[in-house]
Amino acid sequence: LPAQVAFTPYAPEPGSTCRLREYYDQTAQMCCSKCSPGQHAKVFCTKTSDTVCDSCEDSTYTQLWNWVPECLSCGSRCSSDQVETQACTREQNRICTCRPGWYCALSKQEGCRLCAPLRKCRPGFGVARPGTETSDVVCKPCAPGTFSNTTSSTDICRPHQICNVVAIPGNASMDAVCTSTSPTRSMAPGAVHLPQPVSTRSQHTQPTPEPSTAPSTSFLLPMGPSPPAEGSTGD
């Protein structure tokens, strides 16, 4: 490693690497400063002058220490089936997640590219597996002795009420009807709901731009010696 008082730009000692938050500029053959998140390289370093950084313009960002010539463009505005869980700033991209009642059918590194409505189980079917942020509801036919009379993405099959005298037997989509004024007991007097999946975004991660939107991924390597600059209803 270079002497502790080395200021950028400096020539690294043979076999050594540049320090963290620095990169090796092949043209200058010097270790030079990276730009901090929210900035980009306006002027690359030379043998005698360090990198000149500038703030990202509106609707663009950099999330990492970098030496990209231009900031990355923030993603497009969230669609109507999404909510913006992170705004576009100079240091972070916009993140869109699915709104309640929807799940992410096609995800990206952070947030969701394509949302789809959660399947609704029709009468005679109940929720076997609830929907999550990234998976749809799975429905199953109500087993004998249970029913569901709703079209719902959260209701499970409920037991038929127990009658002293049955007026109308229950089936998969209808509860039993009793002749007496009240049943001896009701296994499930109210609708049973499964919790709706809540769209959340992972905390304290610092996502990197997708390769398709970044000049290259080399500037994303935090510990590198900094190689050259990039770049339904139914069942």
Partner: antibody, heavy 119, light 107 residues
Framework: QVQLLESGGGLVQPGGSLRLSCAAS????????MSWVRQAPGKGLEWVSG????????FYADSVKGRFTISRDNSKNTLYLQMNSLRAEDTAVYYC????????????WGQGTLVTVSS | DIQMTQSPSSLSASVGDRVTITCQAS??????LNWYQQKPGKAPKLLIY???TLQTGVPSRFSGSGSGTDFTFTISSLQPEDIATYYC?????????FGQGTKVEIK
Amino acid sequence: QVQLLESGGGLVQPGGSLRLSCAASGFSFSSYAMSWVRQAPGKGLEWVSGISAGGGETFYADSVKGRFTISRDNSKNTLYLQMNSLRAEDTAVYYCARVHPISYGFDIWGQGTLVTVSS
Amino acid sequence: DIQMTQSPSSLSASVGDRVTITCQASQDIKKYLNWYQQKPGKAPKLLIYDASTLQTGVPSRFSGSGSGTDFTFTISSLQPEDIATYYCQQSDNTPVTFGQGTKVEIK
């Protein structure tokens, strides 16, 4: 959720070898540099090795240089540490840790795997 | 390599007390200092990075300050769940290095 799970620790004789693995889930593994940090029984934390997000650049503490090799398989979301010529002083809990790309601290840690080097 | 010196090595305080730990670097590390909490038998947890930035989800009673070579970590009102060993770590350059740790106990 974001998780790191180490495996491969155990008892080994001096001079022997072990390979540690760290399975990552819940985040874009290929976008993050990763590290191994160890902690000898009753002692403090010691950084052992690091690897860049793409795997092209590797770094080692002087105490393990030439004996340990860090690698990663981004297709399997797995980090490795091949440990050869093990010594008694390598006895420690080995943690796999994700490198925070802004601060270069370690923001996600595994639960650790114990490596005991003893005859 | 950059040496990190933490003090004290251990301390005992009462619930509600203000607790301060210091960390000194052997050379200028600017603001690139991180603080971790490690409870017995558990992995360390990042509390503060870049000297003073609180990691997401960390209670606001934890704070950090300093730059250059001298840094301070503070628990404004010690809670029973704060019993742990706290480590500083410099991330100015590789190899990243840790302080020796400060064990915090309840009186």
